[in-house]
């Protein structure tokens, strides 16, 4: 670039030879002259961007080498400059290679392979081993700078390329370059912990692993204790892996070897990159000693019909985990332990459910069912009162010596005995007869057994042949027995 200034204004220096580009053969003398009364210095910018200075206005380079290819700039005291680009043509060194090669995703990357000879053709980029370049890769050659790869993609990472050009019909290649691509950060890191809450006993070891995933190793990550101001936790173990070129994973393992009650609180795993930050928290509760808390059962009194099934369900919280669970029936240990399971999939879960399934219950199987649970520090229990509802059964129906008719029935709940009379012609007995005496006999050892009811009527009130019905009933069902009055007295029962 040569001077052109208006008269009276300071003008830039003049360079001889007066041309913008100069080709010198390697081994020849390079001679440049800067003409300016206020000359300050020559500077030469090498192909790898280093500056060489010369305070003499004549730049003479005997036996010029290819590495002297570049921009020569003359400056004066007014701060004005003029430049010339010199090619030092060397048959043995067509390309000046500036290694290595880095690029950022979505930006351009310059393959530094400027030419020493501008008069070659087909200056281009090729894959090192003659394979095709990626189809979406575009490049722009510039003999003075090199070849620019446009809009670098992640897929180009570690792509091996060479600069190439034809001289006199022969292809010449530069040294190899492999492109190292830095991913553009387009999302926040992915941060996760396996459990969001932890319960420990004093003295236990607390360990929690935070996994951070990002495209680059430059992601920052740390554990913080929120109490309430975030405090950085230094004692953290690091593990990291490259799952692929842009698939980086790091694990930050926080360990408290002997937890104290005041270690309880919220711990945050925090990660950030140039796009933004992400965090996840986990809560630690440290207790002095273990515990078992049985949730209130809605109804510990259970009524079930004879022959049906019932589930006795207990929900409880326990830490440490329960060691012994058992069911006791009427103060005797049951062989049935019940089915115990954790209430959720959360590994640190302390909520449990125990279910005792009682199948086809008999009337004799009512009673107290007690669930006992214990761990190393605590125990707890809950008792269910199970009542088996049974249809009344008439045990005896007799004509006593004193002329009384007596009916004895058992069942649960307590049966009601009603008496009816009907003449022989009637299909159903509907005329009620009032009993003379009703007694409830507590023959059962436990309060859960069937209740026995005895009812009597005076047979002397009957003046006609017919049938007397003793009907025992409760919520479950009814049973009847019949006394027939005829010339020859008989008794028969129908249920």
């Amino acid at each position: 670039s040569q001077p052109s200034a208006s008269p009276g204004e300071p003008s830039p220096p003049s360079i001889h030879p007066a041309q913008s580009e100069l080709i010198v053969e390697a081994g020849d003398t390079l001679s440049l002259t800067c003409i300016d009364p206020d000359f300050v210095r020559w500077t030469f910018k090498t192909y790898f961007n280093e500056m060489v200075e010369n305070k003499k206005n004549e730049w003479i380079q005997e036996k010029a080498e290819a590495t002297r290819t570049g921009t020569y700039t003359c400056s004066n005291s007014n701060g004005l400059t003029s430049s010339i680009y010199v090619f030092v043509r060397d048959p043995a060194k067509l390309f000046l290679v500036g290694l290595p090669l880095f690029g950022k995703e979505d930006s351009d990357a310059l393959v530094r392979c400027p030419l020493t000879d501008p008069q070659v053709s087909n200056y281009s980029l090729i894959e090192c081993d003659g394979k095709s370049l990626p189809t979406d890769l575009t490049f722009v050659p510039n003999p003075k700078a090199g070849i620019t790869i446009k809009n670098v993609k992640r897929a180009y990472h570690r792509l091996c390329v060479r600069c190439a050009a034809q001289r006199d019909g022969t292809w010449l290649h530069s040294d190899k370059f492999t492109l190292k691509v830095r991913a553009a950060i387009k999302a926040i890191p992915v941060v996760s912990v396996p459990e969001t809450s932890h319960l420990l006993k004093k003295g236990d070891t607390f360990t929690v692993v935070c996994t951070i995933k990002d495209v680059s190793t430059s992601v920052n990550s740390m554990w913080l204790k929120m109490n309430p101001q975030p405090q950085h936790i230094a004692q953290v173990k690091h593990n990291s892996w490259h799952r692929g070129d842009f698939n980086y994973e790091r694990q930050e393992t926080l360990t408290i070897s002997s937890a104290r009650v005041d270690d309880s609180g919220v711990f945050m795993c925090y990660a950030n990159n140039t796009f933004g930050s992400a965090n996840v928290t986990t809560t630690l509760k440290v207790v002095e000693k273990g515990f078992i808390n049985i949730s209130p059962v809605k109804n510990t009194t259970v009524f079930v019909t004879d022959g049906e099934n019932v589930d006795l369900v207990v929900e409880y919280e326990a830490y440490p985990k329960p060691e012994h669970q058992q069911w006791i029936y009427m103060n005797r240990t049951s062989a049935n332990k019940g089915k115990d399971y954790v209430k959720s999939d959360n590994k640190s879960n302390i909520r449990y459910v125990n279910q005792l399934r009682l199948t086809r219950l008999k009337g004799t199987e009512g009673g107290t069912y007690t669930f006992l649970v214990s761990n190393s520090d605590a125990s707890a229990s809950v008792t269910f009162n199970v009542y088996v509802n049974t249809k009344p059964e008439i045990l005896t129906y007799d004509r006593l010596i004193n002329g009384m008719l007596q009916c004895v029935a058992e069942g649960f709940p307590e049966p009601t005995i009603d008496w009816y009379f009907c003449t022989g012609a009637e299909q159903r007995c509907t005329t009620p007869v009032s009993p003379v005496d009703v007694q409830v006999q507590n023959v059962s050892v436990s309060p859960f057994g069937k209740l026995v009811v005895q009812s009597s009527i005076d047979s002397s009130v009957f003046r006609h042949n017919g049938t007397v019905e003793c009907k025992a009933s409760n919520d479950v069902g009814k049973s009847s027995a019949f006394f027939n009055f005829a010339f020859k007295e008989q008794i028969q029962a129908h249920t």
Epitope: F48, G98, P100, L101, D175, T178, K180
Partner: antibody, heavy 118, light 111 residues
Amino acid sequence: QVQLVESGGGVVQPGRSLRLSCAASGFTFSRYGMHWVRQAPGKGLEWVAVIWYDGTNKDYTDSVRGRFTISRDNSKNTLYLQMNSLRAEDTAVYYCAREDWAEAFDMWGQGTTVTVSS
Amino acid sequence: DIVMTQSPLSLPVTPGEPASISCRSSQSLLHSNGYNYLDWYLQKPGQSPQLLIYLGSNRASGVPDRFSGSGSGTDFTLKISRVEAEDVGVYYCMQALQTITFGQGTRLEIK
């Protein structure tokens, strides 16, 4: 000539800090990724840290992450390793190395010795 | 991390005889670009390591042609066709595919 020269090593107590330097000359420092590699007495080589040519990307071996920081000043042609919370197992000769186009270490410094001892 | 395992750990050789060192990686070092990211270094007594072979089989500048590297994927070999006294030292393989790891080293000594 082309060379790397480490400095800053010495004897230090556990828990203390030390800063290593690596002065580069004879090549365009700002173009190259740089690494620190260490060698414990009588042991093999262990990679420690890397920094990209422009300082944007950094990575560390897991045992020093959070304690060591790699940095560079391209205007001074110098690579650094700030070592905090030093431990006995950090005792080693620390080398800086230049990464070439093939991601190999084509140039190494002479090493500087760090001894962590109480 | 990728684990690098060298064998033998000690290699006594007579000058003029060939020598061979094996290096095995816990996972393939072959990148999709076709290169194996496996390098060999020699650390002579009292010196810094020096690069011998890069990308599995390419000799570094100034390295004598008696040194050669071969292999792909997980199995690699460094061969010295005729050992000379100046070849004494510890040889390390190193993978650069992921976070850099070295083999434990093979000590070559003259018988």
